[in-house]
């Protein structure tokens, strides 16, 4: 049991995890397999489930981070946060109840996820016992981006981060001292979690605006297999 000031993780129950504490892709957990009579997932449910799957992965990664360092209780995070340009939802992005705008919001979600990719790459060598989960979060985020890109009417408005800038940022982050690397890991996980939560709320407002084709096997489709990428 442990606690951090970002939330209470004492009841760390994760929907898509099996007994080995490994992430199970949506559609592959025992609940899905045991319910062949269930209706196939709709497109919006697919995306919804994919985001929740990623969030569960983040939850597991944060558990390891908070257990091995005191970053989760640190009051110095504001200082470190100023040096990171992590994507964040704001009123102008059209994703909140007030001033909601489907198109603007969808562009923000995709742009934000693309911007997070470099930070997810940074996370890949930051975990010992949760290495697979870090990889799963990264790969399933790529799939989520693809799902959403298929549905964005205004693809021109989506700015893709510059690979050279990303490579330079990655080098800079990896060159930090141990304390700053731990803090960076904590801040990335916290910010990514918040961004996905905001996205989930917004996508639920959109409802069936999102329509990813559902294959004939319904809910049994693997959501995060690398072959899909």
């Amino acid at each position: 049991d442990y606690k951090d000031h970002d939330g209470d993780y004492k009841d760390h129950d994760i929907d898509y995890k099996d007994d080995d504490d490994k992430l199970v892709p949506p559609g592959e957990d025992s609940k899905d397999v045991a319910a062949p009579h269930r209706q196939p997932l709709t497109s919006s449910e697919r995306i919804d489930k994919q985001i929740r799957y990623i969030l569960d992965g983040i939850s597991a990664l944060r558990k390891e981070t908070c257990n091995k360092s005191n970053m989760c209780e640190s009051s110095k995070e504001a200082l470190a946060e100023n040096n990171l340009n992590l994507p964040k939802m704001a009123e102008k992005d059209g994703c909140f109840q007030s001033g909601f705008n489907e198109e603007t919001c969808l562009v923000k979600i995709i742009t934000g996820l693309l911007e997070f990719e470099v930070y997810l790459e940074y996370l890949q060598n930051r975990f010992e016992s949760s290495e697979e989960q870090a990889r799963a979060v990264q790969m399933s985020t790529k799939v989520l981006i693809q799902f959403l890109q298929k549905k964005a009417k205004n693809l021109d408005a989506i700015t893709t981060p510059d690979p050279t800038t990303n490579a330079s940022l990655l080098t800079k982050l990896q060159a930090q001292n141990q304390w700053l690397q731990d803090m960076t890991t904590h801040l990335i996980l916290r910010s990514f979690k918040e961004f996905l939560q905001s996205s989930l709320r917004a996508l639920r407002q959109m409802g069936d605006l999102i329509s990813v084709p559902v294959d004939s096997r319904g809910s049994e489709q693997k959501l995060i297999s690398e072959e899909d990428l």
């Epitope: 939330g7 209470d8 929740r52 969030l55 569960d56 918040e194 989930l200 709320r201 407002q205």
Partner: antibody, heavy 118, light 109 residues
Framework: QSLEESGGRLVTPGTPLTLTCTAS????????MSWVRQAPGKGLEWIGY?????STYYANWAKGRFSISKTSTTVDLKMTSLTAEDTATYFC???????????????WGPGTLVTVSS | YDMTQTPASVEVAMGGTVTIKCQAS??????LSWYQQKPGQPPKLLIY???TLASGVSSRFKGSGSGTEYTLTISGVECADAATYYC????????????FGGGTEVVVV
């Protein structure tokens, strides 16, 4: 960890009123927070949430008349154009943040009574 | 996303079993919580995500359901279980009148 509401009192119809919820033992900035009310002898009625991303969501009936804001130690509920129907005990509650959007309310204050009467 | 709770009131004998139902107007993907409220007290979280018991809650309380239909079952009812029980959807907070059901009063006889 605890929450305590304050500011409830007897007011006349049309009077604006602000209720404050104060946290002890934790920082509110890391949690989704909610206001819920309960008229005498009635059920729970959700007013709204303020999330960690600073966004606010309100019940359809509360939009425009109720407003939620937050600091690291307090959550305020601003109410305008009060009528007798707004007479209720007002609770603030903390959302659990261990997961995604499952906004369960795992810590509640004792409530503060607002009476609207002429 | 309206939540309809039934029955409004139920009498149960000590040691008996009581079942409370909650129906959502649309699927809420198992994001449903149950609360217990006693007179003069704030609500207390009992169950979240349909079936997970909150810390310190007796295993006599059991939650189940999926999609739009959810159930709270209290077995081996005790005097202390006399209270009003509410369901709450945690799925969507947009275009909602109330995230809570209307409540069920459990009277132990």
């Amino acid at each position: 960890q605890s929450l305590e509401e304050s500011g409830g009192r007897l007011v006349t119809p049309g009077t604006p009123l602000t209720l404050t919820c104060t946290a002890s033992g934790f920082s509110l900035s890391s949690y989704d927070m909610s206001w819920v009310r309960q008229a005498p002898g009635k059920g729970l009625e959700w007013i709204g949430y303020i999330y960690t991303d600073t966004s606010t969501y309100y019940a359809n009936w509360a939009k425009g008349r109720f407003s939620i804001s937050k600091t690291s130690t307090t959550v305020d509920l601003k109410m305008t154009s009060l009528t007798a129907e707004d007479t209720a005990t007002y609770f603030c509650a903390k959302g659990s943040t261990d997961y995604a959007f499952d906004t369960r309310l795992d810590l509640w204050g004792p409530g503060t009574l607002v009476t609207v009467s002429s | 996303y309206d939540m309809t709770q039934t029955p409004a009131s139920v009498e149960v004998a000590m040691g008996g079993t009581v079942t409370i139902k909650c129906q959502a107007s649309q699927s809420i993907s198992n994001e449903l919580s149950w609360y217990q409220q006693k007179p003069g007290q704030p609500p207390k979280l009992l169950i979240y995500r349909t079936s997970t018991l909150a810390s310190g809650v007796s295993s006599r309380f059991k939650g189940s359901g999926s999609g739009t239909e959810y159930t709270l079952t209290i077995s081996g009812v005790e005097c202390a279980d006399a209270a009003t029980y509410y369901c709450q959807q945690g799925y969507n907070s947009n275009d909602v009148d109330n995230v809570f059901g209307g409540g069920t009063e459990v009277v132990v006889v």
